[in-house]
């Protein structure tokens, strides 16, 4: 056959669907690869063809659109399963072509099983809620296009394995789930089950997402430098190792660029000639506030190094702060035989 622009296997688009549920999969060509939509392509006389390769097989085969009850069908640029079966897992290809043009892309589809508590290998989207922030909602995701607006589905919400009813601060409101005041105890997996009728049959859509309660922007503060501070003096003799930790607390802030860095005499450590190493560690609280520690280390400090200014800087979207470390040269303890004797007038 004539040449076809082959976009290969789009592994970035790892589609997972539940067994025995409807699934509608749009051809990715129009979403990510081509500059025109299906309507334009169709008007221009292009035809969309679907085929697939079963799991652990190399053979491309046409999709059987003549199954009982139209279990698999195509509508415009959408491939429909009503419902899926476990052995529908495989790589699916959609090809757009006419006599002079051809473009195709493949993508993996995985049909996964769930248990009675909705546990499965499905990768779950994460929805962040701000702690104690007032009413916040999550919406049952990816259910658009499954049924017309005239159909009124029933929606049941679950937290983990438990149906949400008479919960203190969580209220189901159709496709939405409202959190009156989100708390750490609200962390967890939430599932909506959407049930709707179609042609005398009843279908279920199961959608699970992870709720993570994070720090509220109302409580966010500029970075707080815990160390260095005014209470600790780094007193060293030349030749000793100098270790100064910079420990900074950052409030959680969506998309904030949180940074910590040292300057020595106003310059970044790698812009000066002394042998400095910086080691960094990062930890997070339950609400995703962040603590960063950068330890500045000079293996064998010189008397010159002990006269330098060591400043820890921190910055977030809330502001910038800096704190100098108190570094001084240790005064050697007096040696009795010489210094003290001199002091007593000995010769």
């Amino acid at each position: 056959s004539e040449r076809c622009d082959d976009w290969g296997l789009d592994t970035m688009r790892q589609i997972q669907v539940f067994e025995d549920e409807p699934a509608r999969i749009k051809c990715p060509l129009f979403e990510h690869f081509l500059k025109f939509n299906y309507s334009t392509a169709h008007s221009a006389g292009l035809t969309l063809i679907w085929y697939w390769t079963r799991q652990d097989r190399d053979l491309e085969e046409p999709i059987n659109f003549r199954l009982p009850e139209n279990r698999i069908s195509k509508e415009k640029d959408v491939l429909w399963f009503r419902p899926t079966l476990l052995n529908d897992t495989g790589n699916y290809t959609c090809m757009l072509r006419n006599t002079t043009y051809c473009s195709k892309v493949a993508f993996p589809l995985e049909v996964v099983q769930k248990d009675s508590c909705f546990n499965s290998p499905m990768k779950l989207p994460v929805h962040k809620l701000y702690i104690e922030y007032g009413i916040q909602r999550i919406t049952c995701p990816n259910v658009d296009g499954y049924f017309p607006s005239s159909v009124k589905p029933t929606i049941t919400w679950y937290m983990g394995c438990y149906k949400i009813q008479n919960f203190n601060n969580v209220i189901p409101e159709g496709m939405n789930l409202s959190f009156l005041i989100a708390l750490i105890s609200n962390n967890g997996n939430y599932t909506c089950v959407v049930t709707y009728p179609e042609n005398g049959r009843t279908f279920h859509l199961t959608r699970t997402l992870t709720v993570k309660v994070v720090g509220s922007p109302k409580n966010a503060v500029p970075p707080v430098i815990h160390s260095p501070n005014d209470h600790v003096v780094y007193e060293k003799e030349p030749g000793e190792e100098l270790l100064i930790p910079c420990t900074v607390y950052f409030s959680f802030l969506m998309d904030s660029r949180n940074e910590v860095w040292w300057t020595i005499d106003g310059k970044k450590p790698d812009d000066i000639t002394i042998d400095v190493t910086i080691n960094e560690s990062i930890s997070h609280s339950r609400t995703e506030d962040e603590t960063r520690t950068q330890i500045l280390s000079i293996k064998k400090v010189t008397s010159e190094d002990l006269k330098r200014s060591y400043v820890c800087h921190a910055r977030s979207a809330k502001g910038e702060v800096a704190k100098a470390a108190k570094v001084k040269q240790k005064v050697p303890a007096p040696r009795y035989t010489v210094e003290l004797a001199c002091g007593f007038g000995a010769t």
Epitope: D255, S256, R257, E259, W261, K268, D270, Q294, R315, A317
Partner: antibody, heavy 117, light 107 residues
């Protein structure tokens, strides 16, 4: 002094993967900073692609996120860019740069990548 | 994402005159803004960071000001080598974003 040098094929076919490497000289790529990629289509402005932190944490432009990956190889003192499923719209001059928290202070000279069959 | 808008798109100035370039952020970025200069066929060069601090080796005729959402780059007396495209960039939030650029051309 610090220098950055991009390298990679100047011509990539549509649907293939664009791979570029940025060699860092006069400086350790394992420093506690970021390394970034920026591109500039012909006659257009600058577009940030992504950054990689010394720890390996990556940050990407949301418009490219599903297609891009940046990696850091401290043993070779270089970092790399991979952009999947390229189209003509990815034709641009690609720059690598160093980001020491105060914006991109050192840039490579850039490498032109054309996407064409 | 934070959208950076530069104005004007083109600025026609005579050598020796003052040039004022504007950059606006769609939300507050404190003072976490950089300015770059780019000449044809060259990589951008960092001029200003932290909205007002000149990068190493940048002449004093370049100055930056502003905080929050409104920023200005001023070139006090344009030299022939200053005719170029200037970009602003915020690095307060991910994703990092650039303005569309202002071309400073000879009047």
């Amino acid at each position: 002094q610090v220098q950055l040098q991009e390298s990679g094929p100047g011509l990539v076919k549509p649907s293939e993967t664009l791979s570029l490497t940025c060699a860092v000289s006069g400086y350790s790529a394992s420093g506690v900073y970021y390394w970034g990629w920026i591109r500039q289509p012909p006659g257009k402005g600058l577009e940030w692609i992504g950054n990689i932190y010394h720890s390996g944490s990556t940050y990407y432009n949301p418009s490219l996120e599903r297609r891009v990956s940046i990696s850091l190889d401290t043993s070779k003192n270089h970092f790399s860019l991979r952009l999947n499923f390229v189209t003509a719209a990815d034709t641009a001059v690609y720059y690598c740069a160093r980001d020491r928290f105060d914006a991109f202070d050192i840039w490579g000279q850039g490498t032109m990548v054309t996407v064409s069959s | 994402e934070i959208v950076m808008t530069q104005s004007p798109a083109t600025l026609s100035v005579s050598p020796g005159e003052r040039a004022t370039l504007s950059c606006r952020a769609s939300q507050s970025i404190n003072n976490i803004l950089a300015w770059y200069q780019q000449k044809p066929g060259q990589a951008p060069r960092l001029l200003i960071y932290g909205a007002s601090t000149r990068a190493t080796g940048i002449p004093a005729r370049f100055s930056g000001s502003g905080s929050g959402t409104e920023f200005t780059l001023t070139i006090s007396s344009l030299q022939s080598e200053d005719f170029a495209v200037y970009y602003c960039q915020q690095y307060n939030n991910w994703p990092l974003t650039f303005g569309g650029g202002t071309k400073v051309e000879i009047k």
